[in-house]
C-alpha cells in the first residue's frame, strides 16, 4: 500500500436546502484506470461511512440508488455532492481515495471538510 496526497476544502456551508458540494482532488502518481472514492463522516470521535463509489477513469461515478451522494469525475478531481443534510449532520467529512487498478494500490485520505448545515427557520404562522 502506497500513500497518496488528497486535498479538499477545510470548511463548507451547506445550502439552505441541505445540499453540500466539494471537490476532492488526489495526486495520482500513475495512470489509474479504476478508482474508489469513499466519504467518511467524523463527529464526536465516531467515524461512519456516508457513501462510496468505484469508477473507471473517464466514466461517471455510480453510487448506490439509495445513496445521499452523487458525483462527477474529471481527471484527478472528484466533485462530490451530499444531499438531504440537516443540522444534526454537521461534521467533518473525509474523502478517501483508493487507486484500485492497475497495481500498485495507492491510498489517500484527506484532512476532511467541516460541513456546517443550518436547518431552515420555520415559517411564521399565517392566517392566510
Amino acid at each position: 500500500c502506497k500513500a497518496m496526497h488528497v486535498a479538499q476544502p477545510a470548511v463548507v456551508l451547506a445550502s439552505s436546502r441541505g445540499i453540500a458540494s466539494f471537490v476532492c482532488e488526489y495526486a495520482s502518481p500513475g495512470k489509474a484506470t479504476e478508482v474508489r472514492v469513499t466519504v467518511l463522516r467524523q463527529a464526536d470521535s465516531q467515524v461512519t461511512e456516508v457513501c462510496a463509489a468505484t469508477y473507471m477513469m473517464g466514466n461517471e461515478l455510480t453510487f448506490l440508488d439509495d445513496s445521499i451522494c452523487t458525483g462527477t469525475s474529471s481527471g484527478n478531481q472528484v466533485n462530490l455532492t451530499i444531499q438531504g443534510l440537516r443540522a444534526m449532520d454537521t461534521g467533518l467529512y473525509i474523502c478517501k481515495v483508493e487507486l484500485m487498478y492497475p497495481p500498485p494500490y495507492y491510498l489517500g485520505i484527506g484532512n476532511g471538510t467541516q460541513i456546517y448545515v443550518i436547518d431552515p427557520e420555520p415559517c411564521p404562522d399565517s392566517d392566510f
Epitope: V11, D44, S45, A87
Partner: antibody
Framework: QVQLVQSGAEEKKPGAAVKVSCKAS????????ISWVRQAPGQGLEWMGW????????HYAQKFQGRVTMTTDTSTSTAYMELRSLRSDDTAVYYC?????????WGQGTLVTVSS | EIVLTQSPGTLSLSPGERAILSCRAS???????LAWYQQKPGQAPRLLIY???SRATGIPDRFSGSGSGTDFTLTISRLEPEDFAVYYC?????????FGPGTKVDIK
Amino acid sequence: QVQLVQSGAEEKKPGAAVKVSCKASGYTFTSYGISWVRQAPGQGLEWMGWISAYNGNTHYAQKFQGRVTMTTDTSTSTAYMELRSLRSDDTAVYYCARVGPPFDYWGQGTLVTVSS
Amino acid sequence: EIVLTQSPGTLSLSPGERAILSCRASQSVSSNYLAWYQQKPGQAPRLLIYGASSRATGIPDRFSGSGSGTDFTLTISRLEPEDFAVYYCQQYGNSPFTFGPGTKVDIK
C-alpha cells in the same frame, strides 16, 4: 503567512450603510470561511455571521438578519460585510476572522462610528 | 443556539499564580469544538486553544484547555505579566457560532 487586512475607520450618520472589506492572503481563500464579529466599546465579542468562501453560502445571526449582507470576491480574495440602517448602538470595532473552523486568524479591526 | 456562560467575570491574581477559567455550554458542544481566545486592549482576539485542548501555533505551554460536553476549562499554570487580558470561549461545533461573555484576568 496568513494575513487578513481590513479597510479603514468609517464615520456614518444614523440610517446610512457601511461596507467593510477584508483582504486575505497567504492561504487558499476558497478553502475556508470568513466570519464577522463586532465589539462595542467596553463590551464583549458579538458574532454577526459568516460566509463560506467555497460556495458563497451565508449564515447570519438572527439579530442582524435582513440588515447585513456578507459577500466575497474570490478573484481578489476579499470578503465584504455591509450593514444597513445604522443606529448609534452599531458603533463598534468590526473584525473579520478566518473560519478554519476555529477563528484562527483575525483582521486588525475596523472602527465604525455612527453619530448624527 | 448554544449559550456559553463564563465564570468568574473577573479574576484578580498576581504574576506567578495559577488561573482557572470556566466555560459552561447550555447544551453539549459537538465534537468538543470549543475554542479559547485572548484579547488585550486595542488588539484583535488571538486563538489560544481549539478543539477544547489543542494549543494553537505559537501558544506557550503554560496555557492548557480541558473538558468535554458542556463543561470546559482554560488553565494558565503560571501567570506572566503579558497574560493579564480578557479571555473568551467560543463554540464552533454548530452554526450559529457563539461566544461567552468573557473573563477578565487582572493584576491583584
